[in-house]
Amino acid sequence: FSPLRRISIKILVHSLFSMLIMCTILTNCIFMTMNNPPDWTKNVEYTFTGIYTFESLVKILARGFCVGEFTFLRDPWNWLDFVVIVFAYLTEFVNLGNVSALRTFRVLRALKTISVIPGLKTIVGALIQSVKKLSDVMILTVFCLSVFALIGLQLFMGNLKHKCFRNSLENNETLESIMNTLESEEDFRKYFYYLEGSKDALLCGFSTDSGQCPEGYTCVKIGRNPDYGYTSFDTFSWAFLALFRLMTQDYWENLYQQTLRAAGKTYMIFFVVVIFLGSFYLINLILAVVAMAYEEQNQ
């Protein structure tokens, strides 16, 4: 070993070196949170880049760059360090037009903390392992969601467009003439029934157990879907999103109430099955796989 390499190894294995890097990363993170940093922080930025460059040089000199088995670039954690340094020099010395987009990559410096803290390294390692192991569960989840999305598509397509429409029109007005002239929210409220505080017209249905319209209103299928058109089963993709919402239980009770009001109470069976299978079973299966991967990583 050359004297330079020996010195690099000594520095690399020294605990103070890890401490220095750790403190540098944390200080850098603090500086990154500044809203309007003063001019002198530019020099501090250069200092950080210098320390990171020094750290990488020490690692390269001690371990070699990329040829051997345990060299610098053979460790995925060092790829992060390498990218951080490359982007630091790129944003500083190369004029690449939209620099603010490249500045985003400075946030990667915060991720360097992971490679320094051993506990964090274990957790992230487990996370990466779990993602690999999750592929089968993900395929199963997507398959189940797709099947139920197709069922939802068949059962509820267009149902969430059912609205309570005012019966007492002017003599020359028709549903079509009104829909062609409606522009503002105010216009809509004039012809459709809205519950107090609601941003969408009252939903209704044509089956006996679905929601009925109040006196003076009749159920029609017209206009857009609720929630600015985002809640529907009209296409496979929207149905898939709705099912994903059910699986993650993201304000699912609203979707449940909307659909049951438009389609009928009988369809609660569909929601019971989806919540039990998607939300309780599949979510817990995913958690189990993550827990197993973490356990393996710990051992």
Epitope: G158, F206, E215, C219, V220
Partner: nanobody
Framework: EVQLVESGGGLVQAGGSLRLSCDAS????????MRWHRQGAGKQREFVAR???????DYADSVKGRFTISRDNAKNTVYLQMNNLNPEDTAVYYC??????????????????WGRGTLVTVSS
């Protein structure tokens, strides 16, 4: 496809009575309002009477007290009972309805449908 068919028109003496009916057919889920309109020779089409699905009624001033609109929801039919007819009532009477029906491929559509009309002639 939804169809509205008017019937009951014909020739009647002034002061006489007629009962028009309008039958809606097709895969109908709900009929909202149903209206009668009329169009005399060389005149604009004018509103005559309306009935909503909860049986609220409304009439044009010219026919108030003489005409009565009613409906049979089970049969998807609307009736117009015309009493004390006079020559000014001579026109083609059209039926209009706001219908929600199951159309091609089982999808649901709401729209305004019109009949082809039935001629009522009142002679003096």
């Amino acid at each position: 496809e939804v169809q509205l068919v008017e019937s009951g028109g014909g020739l009647v003496q002034a002061g006489g009575s007629l009962r028009l009916s309008c039958d809606a057919s097709g895969r109908i889920l709900r009929i909202g309002y149903m209206r009668w309109h009329r169009q005399g020779a060389g005149k604009q089409r004018e509103f005559v009477a309306r009935i909503t699905d909860d049986s609220a009624t409304d009439y044009a001033d010219s026919v108030k007290g003489r005409f009565t609109i009613s409906r049979d929801n089970a049969k998807n039919t609307v009736y117009l009972q015309m009493n004390n007819l006079n020559p000014e009532d001579t026109a083609v009477y059209y039926c209009e309805a706001l219908v929600t029906a199951s159309v091609r491929g089982g999808s649901i559509h709401s729209g305004t449908y019109w009949g082809r009309g039935t001629l009522v002639t009142v002679s003096s």
